[in-house]
Interface confidence: low
């Protein structure tokens, strides 16, 4: 059982109240985390509650304000960035969101030495991306899809690229599909460690089909949004990587980095770039059929002023049972010799583990092993490697931080977090200062989140950075639901589940059950984290039991479970939710006549297929922004798991796995279909096609659209959405309003 925040039990039960929907919509019980903005081994910046930018020195214990809230307010700044030489700060304002990571903004440069904004050669607006060099105060920025360089903030800019064109050529920033499905960043440029070189990607979207949808706005005529968006099987962006010498940018100009021959022979992707030294860079490439990845280490040739990527420095990673990597192919963490590296990939038993690669992948030395998975390498120093895993006590939904002392042989391993606040904290991430001199631990639960600062040598806790005291006090009179994380063993498959139970749960009674599902490949829903959200309210106030189940296709439990869904999405994910529901019914406290399922995005797809499974298990269900056919979704994501929608590849399963193909099966369930009309990610087209199929089959259903809303359904739409879904479920479960 996962323990929720401890509270003083008051003998007067009436002082305790249930959660309300208003609590959730107002974010009354949201928590804070503290991630230091490290600027050296022992210093970090933090934006104080009153918006001053404060520099903290851990070793002297001193802190001082480097930038006042008055200066921030003078340009309505919402973000900042200190130059590494500490002479300048950029201030970011006029934030305007584009896609998941991307946004444009206006940037002002403040000179700390004279306390004034830099005048002359001001930056254009709006800028798509801006960053300091890692040393000094050079600036690189992207404006109108072209990259510019400034040697100093007050200098005139040097234009690096000239071919940038909206929706056609992207320099230094990704196009839609690379941003969402490959890089997971708003940028596609990378400074070398000392700022000598700048690497960048160029994406050519000229031949990509365009998704067009109406944005209604307030005008007489709606606008049309056009996005080059390659759906499964469509023409993909063409990517090239260039590197320019930033000291003498005009000398030879940008030099293209060659693509490995085995990759260039057919459609391919660039997946990431990692600088090793100022004159060595590592690029990762991926075949369009995403089971072969190549890591290529390239060196600068002074004599030719070019980048050389010898075949002997190409490392191939191939999957024979699924796709390469987990959600993404992992990135390397280089050691101090600047050629060997640490990387997470599947071992011979099919578990993702840390390997040390010195010459070839075949000769890799396995650093971690076991029937659990290494999840992230945080930092490698000369004597330690810090990583996270779900090894401890065999709970896949936990994250603990470990240190391996690589300076000694054999390397010894120690869990840094396993016994810190053990009941409260079982899911950690970490943030390290230079050379891992100090680090912050951020614990996400299952108790109230807490952020702490630690000595990197002894692991001693130095201080609490954020403990969410206000939240703890606010929850003292709240009847929170109980949470259990357990597992079901079914036909040699382990199904971990989280069950959220009403506060006065009584096993002898019968409760309505709501399944919340995501279920996408390499996802994980059953995690030991704290949350007070909509489903907490449904359990606390409305007396529902809510369950989340990680079935086949989910992550961090080995390749057998993960790759089970390869080339057949929409089958086992649904089967496993159904299997779990049957097991929950056997537990005796579920009202079989009141079972619902809901999900968003991939979860909307799974919930729709579960409702249309013909099992008769579900009375009703909700799909928010569902995928309805894999032919409608992005190439990079879809083809990773499904291959191509061609006759000689996997077209048959693309056709068999649609929601529309099961329209008839919705006849005996109550179905609520919800979608935003301006969804750039899972296009409204998906729900439009479900609705059309249901109408054609003369099946009744309920629907709600959110005009001009994207995949996140944010702002006032969120309130409307959850209120609407609550009414729907209460009606389905015959609960009074």
């Amino acid at each position: 059982i996962v323990l929720r925040p401890s509270r003083v039990h008051n003998s007067e039960e009436n002082t305790m109240r249930a959660l309300t929907l208003k609590d959730i919509l107002n974010g009354t019980f949201s928590y804070k985390t503290f991630f230091p903005n490290w600027i050296s081994g022992q210093e970090y910046l933090h934006q104080s509650a009153d918006n001053n930018i404060v520099l903290y020195n851990i070793e002297t214990g001193q802190s001082y304000t480097i930038l006042s809230n008055r200066t921030m307010k003078s340009v309505n700044a919402s973000n900042y960035g200190l130059s590494p030489d500490r002479q300048f700060v950029y201030l970011e304002s006029d934030y305007s969101k584009l896609w998941r990571y991307s946004y444009t903004a206006t940037y002002y440069i403040y000179d700390l030495s004279n306390g004034e904004f830099v005048r002359g050669n001001e930056l254009p607006r709006p800028i798509q991306y801006l960053c300091w060099s890692p040393v000094g105060s050079k600036l690189a920025y992207v404006y109108q899809n072209n990259i510019y360089l400034k040697q100093r903030p007050g200098d005139p800019p040097f234009q690096i690229t000239f071919n940038g064109r909206e929706n056609k050529i992207f320099n230094g920033i990704p196009d839609w599909v690379y941003e969402e499905e490959m890089l997971a960043t708003k940028y596609a440029l990378w400074w070398s460690p000392n700022g000598k070189f700048l690497a960048y990607a160029e994406f050519n979207d000229t031949d990509i089909p365009v998704i067009a949808y109406s944005y209604y706005g307030d005008e007489q005529y709606p606008r049309t949004i056009n996005i080059p968006y390659p759906k499964a099987g469509a023409k993909n962006p063409v990517v090239r990587i260039f590197i320019i010498d930033t000291t003498y940018p005009a000398y030879v100009g940008p030099q293209e980095v060659p693509v490995p021959a085995m990759i260039a022979s057919s459609d391919y992707y660039f997946s990431w770039l990692t600088w090793v030294t100022d004159e060595r860079v590592c690029l990762q490439w991926l075949k369009r059929v995403q089971n072969v990845s190549v890591l290529s280490i390239c060196d600068f040739r002074e004599d030719w002023q070019t980048w050389d990527c010898p075949k002997t420095q190409e490392h191939i990673e191939e999957s024979r049972t699924g796709w390469a990597g987990g959600f993404f192919v992992s990135t390397p963490v280089f050691s101090y010799d600047a050629i060997s590296y640490y990387k997470i990939f599947s071992d011979k038993d099919g578990y993702k583990h840390i390997h040390y690669i010195k010459d070839t992948v075949e000769n890799a030395i396995q650093i971690t092993s076991g029937k659990w998975e290494a999840i992230n390498i945080f930092r490698v120093t000369q004597d330690s490697l810090f990583y996270s895993s779900n090894e401890f006590e065999e709970y896949p939904g936990r994250r603990n931080i470990y240190r391996i002392s690589i300076g000694s042989y054999p390397p010894s391993k120690k869990c840094v977090t396993c016994h810190l606040r053990k009941e409260r904290c079982q899911y950690y991430t970490a943030s390290f200062s230079d050379y891992a001199k100090y680090y912050a631990l951020v614990c996400y639960g299952p108790g109230i989140p807490i952020s702490t600062l630690h000595d990197g040598r002894t692991d001693q806790e130095i201080k609490i950075l954020e403990e969410n005291k206000e939240l703890e006090n606010a929850l003292k009179n709240i009847q929170l639901p109980k949470e259990e994380i357990k597992k079901l063993e079914v036909d040699e498959i382990t199904l971990w589940y989280k069950m959220i139970l009403p506060p006065q749960f009584d096993r002898s009674k019968k409760y309505p059950l709501l399944i919340q599902v995501y279920g996408g490949p390499c996802s994980q829903s059953v995690r030991s984290v704290f949350a007070v959200n909509w489903i907490s309210y449904l359990a606390s106030k409305e007396g529902m039991v809510i369950a989340l189940v990680d079935g086949r296709g989910t992550a961090f439990q080995g390749d057998k479970l993960l790759y089970a869904v390869y080339r057949k999405l929409g089958v086992y994910e649904v089967e496993d939710q159904i299997t779990a529901v049957r097991k929950f019914i056997e537990m005796g406290f579920i009202d079989e006549k009141r079972i619902a399922i809901w999900g968003w995005s991939y979860g909307g797809y799974v919930s729709s297929l579960a409702l249309a499974s013909g099992t008769g298990l579900f009375k009703c269900g909700i799909a928010v922004a569902p995928v309805s056919s894999w032919e409608y979704y992005a190439s990079v994501y879809t083809e990773r798991f499904m291959g191509l929608p061609t006759k000689d590849d996997n077209l048959e399963h693309y056709k068999n796995s649609t929601v529309m193909a099961r329209a008839e099966y919705f006849r005996n369930v109550d179905y609520l279909l919800i979608h935003g009309t301006a969804d750039d990610n899972v296009h409204f087209q998906n729900s439009a096609q479900i609705a059309k199929a249901l109408v054609n089959a003369q099946v009744d259903f309920q629907a709600m659209w959110y005009s001009d809303q994207n995949h996140g359904l944010s702002g006032l739409s969120t309130n409307h959405l959850y209120t609407h879904m609550t009414h729907f479920l209460k009606q389905c479960f015959s609960l009074s309003d």
Epitope: R403, K414, H419, E461
Partner: antibody
Framework: DVQLVESGGGLVHPGGSLRLSCAAS????????MSWVRQAPGKGLEWVSG????????YYTDSVKGRFTISRDNSKNTLYLEMNSLRAEDTAVYYC?????????????WGQGTTVTVSS | EIVLTQSPGSLSLSPGERATLSCRAS??????LAWYQQKPGQAPRLLIY???TRATDIPDRFSGSGSGTEFTLTISSLQSEDFAVYYC??????????FGGGTKVEIK
Amino acid sequence: DVQLVESGGGLVHPGGSLRLSCAASTFTFANYIMSWVRQAPGKGLEWVSGITGSSTNTYYTDSVKGRFTISRDNSKNTLYLEMNSLRAEDTAVYYCAKHQLYPYYAMDVWGQGTTVTVSS
Amino acid sequence: EIVLTQSPGSLSLSPGERATLSCRASQPIDSYLAWYQQKPGQAPRLLIYGASTRATDIPDRFSGSGSGTEFTLTISSLQSEDFAVYYCQQYYDWPPVTFGGGTKVEIK
């Protein structure tokens, strides 16, 4: 020389209480995890309780949970063990010990021990 | 909790002989194992930590080896002051810190 000196032991009736102290000298006390280890007459070593440098975490062996409380005062370089509801089986020599710094946590400095006798 | 089993329970040897003491862990503990020496009426003294690293001022006739579940303390040539009880201790997964039952090395 790094030293640990325990005090506070003695004869006590079952159900009674005692408070042991351990005074540390010549090392940065606050940086180190400290533990109490006991040894019943003619028996082996048994770890009883531990406390982290900043007192953030306290640890106990199952048999003393709820009865014993470990604490420390870093300003006084002193470690304490408050023992309540004492039983005959708590009779032992109690040692305080300093742990090494990460990653080993072996106990590199021990006090000379203080004797606790629980008898009616 | 991790259980440490020491063998043999006691060992009768003459000065100058080699002593080999064994410690087995109920589950793998990497090299998070220490060895202590205790003489009658005295507090334990740290000999070895990290399975094989000698503590400060410990003579080189004491050596430790092993990793995982099997560990050995070797005293290459017993001196009269080495006759004592030896304990192994794990700190891989704690709390609780656990000790082995001890091996008594006595004069033959």
